[in-house]
Interface confidence: low
């Protein structure tokens, strides 16, 4: 999906009210030194596709990201302020829906989360310092 | 109304240094990067740089990294740009430019530096 | 660094023409690319964004287009007002490098 026509400010400001804070919630428990954030991304087109990636793309360690309340509130802010992003989604739904039944916080999803929060940080300050 | 006003054109000789200003209205300054792109006469445009007014981290290209200096006063809105060891290639139209994601919405009116014996 | 090479340096037309610009980028750059008009004087001023989204304000007869590498701008109507020098810009990351202008000129 092109994130290049999505409408940002919409996007920030649902990030803003809700999302960070299901984000922190997940974390909590967790020291913010704890994981060392490896991913990045250059603007915010980029951000949210690395953030797409992240929340709904099921990982060796971590499945279960889409059934959390900040993946749902993302999932909603993206389907709604950018076009047609929930027509290129409905096939991934499903194989989501059929990837995992349950929640399971394990480390390997608290690290992910983790590298969530730094994308979204930069979503917030795009650019990337150095390339 | 956003507006970037840039301080007024400049002569200088060889050797000497030189600092342009550019203040910011309208909008939150801290919020966007600010760049710097200059002009030499009848030629093309050139980046030289940039600086996250939030934490004056500055991001400088390796041709003008030993004579650029950028910062920020973050109590009037403006931005810095100071040229060291001046020569007469330098001269040119320097500009500022805001951007959020690597795009110029906003320049400023430019300000000439000539450089001359 | 990612060079762009921007086409043609200079072309003639007259006003109603189809004028199109075209810029390429050295390697992969995605949507990443703007497109400015600079009057002589004058500060450049932003028309395209991310390749093809119109800035505010820039009359619908421009418009940027993007196949692989390559990056084109177009006229489809060129006006009085349009005779100017256009530079395309990538903003994927550091450094930020620009074309070298094409100057379009009354014929």
């Known amino acids: 999906y092109d994130f290049t026509n999505c409408d940002f400010e919409k996007i920030k400001a649902a990030y803003l009210s809700t999302i960070s804070k299901d984000l922190i919630t997940y974390m909590s428990g967790t020291k913010s030194t704890e994981f060392n954030n490896t991913v990045s991304c250059s603007n915010r087109p980029h951000c949210l596709t690395e953030i797409q990636s992240l929340t709904f793309n099921p990982t060796a360690g971590c499945a279960s990201l889409a059934k959390e309340m900040f993946a749902m509130k993302t999932k909603a802010a993206l389907a709604i302020w950018c076009p047609g992003y929930s027509e290129t989604q409905i096939n991934a739904t499903q194989a989501m829906k059929k990837a995992r039944k349950s929640k399971v916080t394990t480390n390997k999803c608290l690290e992910q989360v983790s590298q969530l929060q730094g994308l979204w940080r930069r979503f917030n300050r795009p650019l990337l310092k150095q390339q | 109304e956003v507006q970037l006003v840039q301080s007024g054109a400049e002569v200088k000789k060889p050797g000497a240094s030189v600092k342009v200003s550019c203040k910011a209205s309208?909008?939150?300054?801290?919020?966007?990067?600010m760049h710097w792109v200059r002009q030499a006469p009848g030629q093309g445009l050139e980046w030289m740089g940039m600086?996250?007014?939030?934490?004056?981290?500055?991001t400088l290209i390796q041709k003008f990294k030993d004579r650029v200096t950028m910062t920020v006063d973050k109590s009037t809105s403006t931005a810095y740009m100071e040229l060291s060891s001046l020569r007469s290639e330098d001269t040119a139209v320097y500009y500022c430019a805001r951007t959020l994601d690597g795009y110029y919405d906003y320049w400023g009116q430019g300000t000439t530096v000539t450089v001359s014996s | 660094d990612i060079q762009m090479t921007q086409s043609p340096s200079s072309l003639s037309a007259s006003v109603g023409d189809r004028v199109t610009i075209t810029c390429r980028a050295s390697?992969?750059?995605?949507?990443?690319l703007a497109w400015y008009q600079q009057k002589p004087g004058k500060s450049p001023q932003l028309l395209v964004y991310?390749?093809?989204t119109l800035a505010e304000g820039v009359p619908s007869r421009f418009s940027g287009s993007v196949s692989g590498t390559q990056f084109t701008l177009t006229i489809s109507s060129l006006q009085p007002e349009d005779f100017a020098t256009y530079y395309c810009q990538h903003h994927y990351g550091t450094p930020w490098t620009f074309g070298g202008g094409t100057k379009v000129e009354i014929k």
């Open positions: 309208g909008y939150t300054f801290t919020t966007y990067w």
């Open positions: 600086i996250d007014p939030s934490d004056s981290e500055t």
């Open positions: 991310f390749a093809k």
């Open positions: 390697e992969n750059i995605y949507s990443y």
